[in-house]
C-alpha cells in the first residue's frame, strides 16, 4: 500500500541512507507560467 512517509528531514532518519528525497511538507509549487 502507498505511504506518505518521507516528509521529514534526511538528517532525522535513522538508517544510513533512507533513499528518500526531502519532500518537505511546507513546500509549495509555483504555478506554471
Amino acid at each position: 500500500s502507498e505511504t506518505t512517509t518521507g516528509t521529514s528531514s534526511n538528517s532525522s532518519q535513522s538508517t544510513s541512507n533512507s533513499g528518500l528525497a526531502p519532500n518537505p511538507t511546507n513546500a509549495t509549487t509555483k504555478a506554471a507560467g
Epitope: S1, E2, T3, T5, G6, S9, N10, S11, T15, S16, N17, S18, G19, L20, A21, P22, N23, P24, A27, T28, T29, K30
Partner: antibody, heavy 117, light 113 residues
Framework: QVTLKESGPALVKPTQTLTLTCTVT?????????VSWIRQPPGKALEWIGY???????RYNPSLKTRLTISRDTSKNQFVLTMTNMDPVDTATYYC??????????WGQGTTVTVSS | DIQMTQSPSSLSASVGDRVTITCRSS????????????LTWYQQKPGKAPKLLIS???TRASGVPSRFSGSGSGTDFTLTISSLQPEDFATYYC?????????FGGGTKLEIK
C-alpha cells in the same frame, strides 16, 4: 559491486498487465535505500514511476498511481513492478535504479517494452 | 509537480570546447534544513542507462572527471564541461530530487560539430 537488472516481456498487448522484475545484487534490499522504476519512451525524456523503500513502503507518481503496484521479494532480493491496462503510449524502456538521499546512483540496463496488438 | 526546463535542447560543439547546459526549476530546490540544492545531473549515451554525474547541484559522483562541474542554487543551475572529450558526446538530463513526484528535464543532446 552493486548491480540491478530488469527482466520481463518485450511485448504486451493493449489492456494487458505488465509485470517487470528488478533483481539486485551487491547489497541487501532491506538494509537501506529505495529502488525506483523510471521509464523512457523512444526518443523522449525520463519519467519517474514510483519507488519502494527498504522498509517496504511505496510511493507512486500520481499520474500513474491507479495502475501501479510495486512490491518486493526479500528472499530473492527482487522488486516487482506491475502496471495494469497497458496502452501504446506506455511503450518505453523501463529502468530500475537505486535511490539515495540525493540521486539515483546505480541503474539497471533497462528493458524495452512495446505495447501493440 | 515541479517542472524542469533545460536549454538548449541540442548543442553542437567540438572536442576541446567549453560547454554550458542550463536547467531551471519551477520551484526552488534549496532545502532550508540542510542548505543543499536537490538538483542532480545525469549523462546518457544511446542504448545505455543514465549515469550519475553530479548530485546536490555541485558534488561530482565517484569517478566523474573534474572537467564536469555543476553550479547554481534555488531555481537556476548549470552543468559545465570545461574541455569536451570525445566520450562526452551524449544526452544530459537534470532532475529534481526534492519533492515527489521526482521530475526530469527534457534533456540536452550534445553532438559533434
Amino acid at each position: 559491486q552493486v548491480t540491478l537488472k530488469e527482466s520481463g516481456p518485450a511485448l504486451v498487448k493493449p489492456t494487458q498487465t505488465l509485470t517487470l522484475t528488478c533483481t539486485v545484487t551487491g547489497y541487501s534490499i532491506t538494509s537501506g535505500y529505495t529502488v525506483s522504476w523510471i521509464r523512457q519512451p523512444p526518443g523522449k525524456a525520463l519519467e519517474w514511476i514510483g519507488y519502494i523503500q527498504y522498509t517496504g513502503s511505496t510511493r507512486y507518481n500520481p499520474s500513474l498511481k491507479t495502475r501501479l503496484t510495486i512490491s518486493r521479494d526479500t528472499s530473492k532480493n527482487q522488486f516487482v513492478l506491475t502496471m495494469t491496462n497497458m496502452d501504446p503510449v506506455d511503450t518505453a524502456t523501463y529502468y530500475c535504479a537505486r535511490g539515495t538521499t540525493a540521486s539515483f546512483d546505480y541503474w539497471g540496463q533497462g528493458t524495452t517494452v512495446t505495447v501493440s496488438s | 509537480d515541479i517542472q524542469m526546463t533545460q536549454s538548449p535542447s541540442s548543442l553542437s560543439a567540438s572536442v576541446g570546447d567549453r560547454v554550458t547546459i542550463t536547467c531551471r526549476s519551477s520551484q526552488s530546490l534549496l532545502y532550508s534544513s540542510d542548505q543543499k540544492n536537490y538538483l542532480t545531473w545525469y549523462q546518457q549515451k544511446p542504448g545505455k542507462a543514465p549515469k550519475l554525474l553530479i548530485s546536490w547541484a555541485s558534488t561530482r559522483a565517484s569517478g566523474v572527471p573534474s572537467r564536469f562541474s555543476g553550479s547554481g542554487s534555488g531555481t537556476d543551475f548549470t552543468l559545465t564541461i570545461s574541455s569536451l572529450q570525445p566520450e562526452d558526446f551524449a544526452t544530459y538530463y537534470c532532475q529534481q530530487y526534492f519533492i515527489y513526484p521526482l521530475t526530469f528535464g527534457g534533456g540536452t543532446k550534445l553532438e559533434i560539430k
